[in-house]
Structure formats: C-alpha cells, structure tokens
Amino acid sequence: LKVFAKPKITYVENQTAMELEEQVTLTCEASGDPIPSITWRTSTRNISSEEKASWTRPEKQETLDGHMVVRSHARVSSLTLKSIQYTDAGEYICTASNTIGQDSQSMYLEVQYAPKLQGPVAVYTWEGNQVNITCEVFAYPSATISWFRDGQLLPSSNYSNIKIYNTPSASYLEVTPDSENDFGNYNCTAVNRIGQESLEFILVQADTPSSPSIDQVEPYSSTAQVQFDEPEATGGVPILKYKAEWRAVGEEVWHSKWYDAKEASMEGIVTIVGLKPETTYAVRLAALNGKGLGEISAASEFKTQPVQGEPSAPKLEGQMGEDGNSIKVNLIKQDDGGSPIRHYLVRYRALSSEWKPEIRLPSGSDHVMLKSLDWNAEYEVYVVAENQQGKSKAAHFVFRTSAQPTAIPANGSPTSG
C-alpha cells in the first residue's frame, strides 16, 4: 500500500547580512511524498520561473544577472544571494509542490547598511522666505542625522532662524534667511553603526525672473490676445503671475492686469480687455515670482480693429468629471465685438441623438456643467456668445463619456457657473 503525503515545509530560517558582504544563503526544507520540488519567489520577483544562465545541472540554477543561485538536493533547497545589496532585504517565500498539493513558508532577510542620502542639492529662496532643505535617508539600522554649517552643529545660538524636523525617512532643515550670510552650504550627515555618509546642500538666493518676450499680438475691436514666450530665467523659483501693462499711444498712464501663471503659460496667451476700437496701443509684460517682479519686456505696438458688432465665439475646454458621465465645459471669453456680452447659449446632444433643451448662461459665466450624461457616448456641445449686435459663430467641442462603472453615483441636472 503506497501512502502519498502533501508537502510540508519543515525548516526555514531568517538571515541577517551586511551590504557588500560576499554572500548569504537562505534554506528551505520540506517533507512529502512524492518528494516535492521547491521554488523561490519574493514579493516582486518569481526567481524560479526566471530565465536561467545555466541549465546544465538542474540541481544548480543561476539567474542571468548572476546575483542569485538556487541549489536543490532531495528535500532541501537553498537560495544564495551574492554581493548583497540593501535592496535584497525583505520577504522570501519558498513553495514546496508535488502532485498531491503544495505548502509555502516565508523567511526574512535583514540587510544592514551604512546610510545613503539624497535630496535636491540646490534649494532656492529669498530673504524672509522660509524654506525646507530635505535630506532623505535610507539606512539600517536607523541612522542619527546631524546638520552642520561651516563645521558648526545646528541648531546653534548663531543660527536662531533654523529649525530641524526629523521623520524616520528624512530630516528637514527649516531655514528662514534674514541676511546674505544665511545663503550657502549646509551639510547633512547620517551615522549608524555600519558607517556614515554626508551630503552637501546649497541654499541659493533666488532672483526675480527675466522678462517674457512678446511673440505677436492678435487685436480685436475691444480686446487683444498677447502671445508670449516664458522668461528664459525663472530666478530659481516658480513664476506665480504675469503682469500686462498697456496704454494707447500718446497716453502717459499704463493700465495693468495680473494673470495667473499656470493659466497663462498653458496657452502662452494673455488677453487684455477694455480697449477702444481703431486705436494704436503699446503692450508689455513682466513675470512675478516669490522674490518679486522681474524686468519688463520691450513694448509691442498693435492697432485694434473697427467695431465688428457681434462677439467672437468663446473658446471651449472640457474637464471630465470624476464620475465619468459629467463634464465641466469651460468658456473662455474672446472679443465682445465692442458691446458687452449679454449671455451664452449652450446646446448639446449625444451624437445621432436628441438635442437637449438650450441652456442660457449669464454673461459672467465661465463654465457650464453637463451632468447625467449617457455612458460611453460621444457628445457634441455648441456655444455662442450674444451681445446687442447679435450672436457669435458657434464654438464646438466633442467629447466621449466613460464606460459605465459597476456602481453609479447619483447626479443632478446641468448647472452653470
């Protein structure tokens, strides 16, 4: 009478190794009948199913990179890792299988290594503007982090404008520079019993941006679109706003308007409004960052067009709702044709389907929300602007809704803003 037995892993052992150590071996023993075969994997890598460098001896298999070797003999399998790296640390699973069944068991490899540091080496700020210098640390066992300035341990009485915050994975040096002296080098040093590492950071005084350059101006009767290139130098910190200044030729006073940098940079266009028809204007641009307003560009001249009467069609941009069957259609006002826009008219439908009732939006609206749309359907939207003189040409936008999810969120009817 032959009695078969399911595999059972009878022995595994956790291991500890040092980084750059020559090798470490993990062992897995199993019982069972027929004799089980043993395979190895980690949470990210199926070692046993990888292509091997050598199949000449099935009892010894080496990975292509030569980093791991699996040896099997009867009921015992070993996994040897060569030239240990700190990324080798973690869970290793051995699985014993035969025709009756299988069994798996985890073991853990702990790799001890000297600290490794990283972070953005150059950090920009300006006097009075608080900034964090981030020193990310990878170490096992965990490291002690110290900050130095000119060899002096921080914080110190000489540097009252400095604070230090530590988390398990990083140390943050919070600096509020109050003079020229606070800019320069800062040293982050991490120490554990395996070793130490230092990383030099430099705190750089940000500058104001250089001037944007005006490419071309597209004038209408009461507005103009100014197309520009971003400043070549941002000063090391993000540009926050653009400032447009314009005046009619012969006038002394410049009119001005601020524009959000993200919106303006997306299209590289700012629109100036409230212009007189058939008038020559000069326009110039400057960029603002946290440090301050940068140098102003050379002025560019243009002449507005005669009154056209009806407005220009708005530009349309769509943002699909997270629910997948709604959309926010942004209306970007263009030229009003010389008289104020009274309202926008919106019509939309699923293609090849019925038109929804027309939506009338007040002149100040900058978007319309279309909700409760059909799933996985193509829609078209038309919008006109209307002033006292008449309607603009229709602006057009096509989009597709998402495929229907399993759970449908509740929705309302179209709304405007």
């Epitope: 008219l345 040409k393 229709a394």
Partner: antibody, heavy 124, light 106 residues
Framework: QVQLQQSGPGLVKPSQTLSLTCAIS??????????WNWIRQSPSRGLEWLGR?????????DYAVSVKSRITINPDTSKNQFSLQLNSVTPEDTAVYYC??????????????WGQGTMVTVSS | EIVLTQSPATLSLSPGERATLSCRAS??????LAWYQQKPGQAPRLLIY???NRATGIPARFSGSGSGTDFTLTISSVQAEDVGVYYC????????FGQGTKVEIK
Amino acid sequence: QVQLQQSGPGLVKPSQTLSLTCAISGDSVSSNSAAWNWIRQSPSRGLEWLGRTYYRSKWYNDYAVSVKSRITINPDTSKNQFSLQLNSVTPEDTAVYYCARENIAAWTWAFDIWGQGTMVTVSS
Amino acid sequence: EIVLTQSPATLSLSPGERATLSCRASQSVSSYLAWYQQKPGQAPRLLIYDASNRATGIPARFSGSGSGTDFTLTISSVQAEDVGVYYCQQYHGTPTFGQGTKVEIK
C-alpha cells in the same frame, strides 16, 4: 453666398439604385458647424427627411428608420459635395429629392439652404 | 418618431387679414421648431427657426411663438405673395415635418 446644386438622373428602374449628388459652394462639407441632409417630397408622404452626413472630428451619418437598410450618404471632401444612394427602389420612392444644409454656425439649426430639387421617377 | 400635426389644412384669407397657423407636436420639442414656406415648383424656404426667430431676409409680418408641444406661425397682414404651403418641422430629434397648411387669397 451658400448654394447647393443637385445632379443625377430623373428616371430609375425598380430594384435599381437611385444616385444623386449635391455640390456645395460657399461652405465646406467638412464644417463642424453644419450637417448635410437629403429630404424628399411626394404627394403621399409629404416632406420626409431621409438622412444626413456631418463631420465632428470624424464622419457621422444619421438615417431615417424607414430607409435605413437601403440608404447611404457619403461626403466627398475633394469635390466638396455629398451624395445619396438609395438601393432597391420601388415606385413608392418616386418623389422630388432635395439636399439641404442644417446651419449650426449661425445658430439657425433648421434647413436654411436647399438645393433646387430633383424629380425622380421610379418606373420600368 | 415625433409627429407634427398642422391645422387648419387650408386657410383662405383676404389681403391684409391676419393668418394664424398652428402646429402641435406629439411630445415636447423644446423650442427646436422651424417654419417653412413653399411655393409651387420651388424648394421650401426657411421662415422661422427656434420657434420664434426670423430667418435672414424674412419680412417682419411673419412671426412665430410657442414652446414644448404647441406652436403658432402668424402672418400679421397677409399679402398676395404669401400664398403657398407652410410646413412646420422639429429638429429636437430625428427631423420630422408637419403635413402642411395651404394659404390662399380669396
């Protein structure tokens, strides 16, 4: 000034295919603010919409249920025209056939421009 | 499909009289309704769109009203050249036409 000029035979034999063309001047068949339609008129059925073609980043066609299995409307961008093909015609298809524009650009939506009409007789 | 019913079938008027033509939809078409005039041997001509907007070049004596299911075309003072058949048409969904109202001068 937009004009639609129709062309095609006035006599078609039963079971054959009726083919008409509508040439556009002053507008584009590829406009995303227009749709190009075929409509017919007979004493028994009155005015009957047959179908349309329109471009909205790709080409679309809508057809009347009554002729869906027999109709094809095709745009021809190189000649700025569109055509009607109606297969397997019977004497019931005898009518005046019109092409017409639906004008969205001017927010008119209805059929603002019509062709001159083509009288098509289906007879052996 | 949306059915449009026009009344009356024929309207006989003296010049200068007011003409009122009616169009009723089998379901709501919002304001997506047009009126056309057709003279013998000619293609229909657009008079009114969106229920109440006069098309380019249409005389002010033509006006439209209504929304939903009930619509009216009014000719404030009928002229001899206004004779013909008048059709309503909806474009809310698949386009359909009414059967027409014939306007004649007494």
